[in-house]
Every structure is written in C-alpha cells, then in structure tokens.
C-alpha cells in the first residue's frame, strides 16, 4: 500500500507534514512521528531551546540559543 503525501502507517491514517516555520520545526520519521529540528522542542517543535543556563523564570527565547530577559532582569542568563 502506498500512502498519499504526508500520510503514514498501516491504513495510512497517521498524518505528518514536515515544516520549518512559525508553527513548527520538524521532520517526519518513517512512522509519521515528528522529529524536532536541532534547537527546538515540544510536541509541535515550536518551542525554542534557549541558551544553556538561561533562567526559566526570568528569561525566554524566540530563537534557539537566545536568552531574552524580562523587564528588571539582566545578564547572560537573565539571573
């Protein structure tokens, strides 16, 4: 059985479209599961992995490796 584009698995009922945009950064494995690109995490691979050591409470990032501080916090790790 050959599945339609972006459909995977027995019965072709698993859907996965690789994407690299605002809504996700992932490839699809042979079973149609999302595999996050380097620097991204979460079920939709849309959460950037911040700079190692970046304060989870006072820092955040839109892009992998970043560490943007909340107002009132500073430093390489916003700590």
């Amino acid at each position: 059985v050959t599945c339609d584009d972006y459909y995977y698995g027995f019965g072709c009922n698993k859907f996965c479209r690789p994407r690299d945009d605002f809504f996700g950064h992932y490839a699809c494995d042979q079973n149609g599961n999302k595999t996050c690109m380097e620097g991204w995490m979460g079920p939709e691979c849309n959460r950037a992995i911040c700079r190692q050591g970046c304060s989870p409470k006072h820092g955040s990032c839109k892009l992998p490796g970043d560490c943007r501080c909340q107002y009132g916090w500073q430093g390489l790790y916003c700590d």
Epitope: D4, D5, Y6, F15, C16, R17, D21, F22, F23, G24, K34, G42, P43, E44, N46, R47, A48, S60, C61, K62, L63, D66, R68
Partner: antibody, heavy 119, light 107 residues
Framework: QVQLVQSGAELKKPGSSVKVSCKAS????????MHWVRQAPGQGLEWMGA????????AYAQKFKGRVTLTADKSTSTAYMELSSLRSEDTAVYYC????????????WGQGTLVTVSS | DIQMTQSPSSLSASVGDRVTITCRAS??????LAWYQQKPGKAPKLLIY???TLADAVPSRFSGSGSGTDYTLTISSLQPEDFATYYC?????????FGGGTKLEIK
C-alpha cells in the same frame, strides 16, 4: 481537559483600545501557540494571528498588522489580544483558540468575547 | 495568501437528506483542510481535519474528501441537530483563512 476561558464583554468608543484575555488550563501553556479568530455579527470567521507563549513569537494576518498586539503571561497561563484604533467594523465576537494534538487545527475554543464599538 | 471559496453560501434540506458542501482553495493546500460546524451563539466545533479525518466524537455520517485545491464535506443523512453553519479552513501556511460559510437550513 483543555479549557480556554475568556474575559467578559466590552463596550468601547471609536478610536480607543480593547484588551481581551484568555486563560488556559489543562495543558502545558507553552507547548502550543494560541490563535485569535474574530466573527462580526452575521459574518464569517477571520483569523487574526497567533502567539508562541514560550518565547513570545507572533504571526499576524496582514489586515491586522500594526493594530493588534498579542502577548502571553506564562506565569498565569493567560494570552492577551489588544486591538487599537477601534472602529465600528471591529464590533465582533473574539475567540482564542488552540490546535489539537496531532497537527490538526482549532480543536479547542474559548467561549468568545463580544466587543462592541459604538459612540 | 491562499483564499478559500465555499459553496453554496446557503442550503435548504430535509432530515434524512444527503448534503454536500464544497470548498476550493486558490492554491494547493495538500489536504491541510478542516471543517467546522457552528451554531448560533456558540464557538465553532471541529468536525474534520486533514481533509478526511473525523475529529473526536463526530458522528460517522460526516465525511470529508478531496485533494489539491478541491474539497468536499458530506453529511450522509441529515439529522435535526445538523442544521447549522459550516466553515472550511486551510492550515497550510499563514494566514489560515476560512471559507465564507454555508448556512444549512431546514426545508
């Protein structure tokens, strides 16, 4: 279970701004972007934009760029939609909405917030 | 931007009828299409995603088909609770636009 609870109805004057809140529960707030959709009385659905609560990244429909601001407060799992320079055509029900778990679109919706713009 | 054209805009039918609503995208959306049902005063409810997959707890009388730019929602045997407005929406790329809606009324 996933729940999205929105703030109450608003009556605004033309030229003013409105800020609608959407409190999320039942899932990890930073795992999924929050989208905003509006519906004018008797009209169809219109996608306005989305925010990634984890990092604050945003995507906006061209029509709303410069007039809408999406923000998120991770500490309270609350997303906000602020619309400025209001005009009568902005009278609508505003919904926050979230994708489902398997890449399908808007499976979860807030109850909607009616914003009325009138002088 | 991809535009979605939905037809018809309104439709009168009777309980037990088979009903078809179509949606045409201005570009290939590769099955990235959803269908919603909305009743007055309520938020939309997801019926079908990825063009043909039924969302949780949606009755099997609803089905979706299509590919490329042309998609169809079919209700095989209308029930009284099915009278509502139906919307298609693509989610291939932002902006995720909706069709104009189809109001399904009792004949």
């Amino acid at each position: 279970q996933v729940q999205l609870v929105q703030s109450g109805a608003e009556l605004k004057k033309p030229g003013s701004s409105v800020k609608v809140s959407c409190k999320a529960s039942g899932y990890t707030f930073t795992d999924y972007e929050m989208h905003w959709v509006r519906q004018a009385p008797g009209q169809g659905l219109e996608w306005m934009g989305a925010i990634q609560p984890g990092g604050g990244g945003t995507a906006y429909a061209q029509k709303f760029k410069g007039r809408v601001t999406l923000t998120a407060d991770k500490s309270t799992s609350t997303a906000y939609m602020e619309l400025s320079s209001l005009r009568s055509e902005d009278t609508a029900v505003y919904y926050c909405t979230r994708r489902g778990y398997d890449d399908y679109p808007f499976a979860y919706w807030g109850q909607g917030t009616l914003v009325t713009v009138s002088s | 931007d991809i535009q979605m054209t939905q037809s018809p805009s309104s439709l009168s039918a009777s309980v037990g009828d088979r009903v078809t609503i179509t949606c045409r995208a201005s570009g290939n959306i590769h099955n990235y299409l959803a269908w919603y049902q909305q009743k007055p005063g309520k938020a939309p409810k997801l019926l079908i995603y990825n063009a043909k997959t039924l969302a949780d707890a949606v009755p099997s009388r609803f089905s979706g088909s299509g590919s490329g730019t042309d998609y169809t929602l079919t209700i095989s045997s209308l029930q009284p609770e099915d009278f509502a407005t139906y919307y298609c929406q693509h989610f291939w790329s932002a902006p995720w636009t909706f069709g104009g809606g189809t109001k399904l009324e009792i004949k």
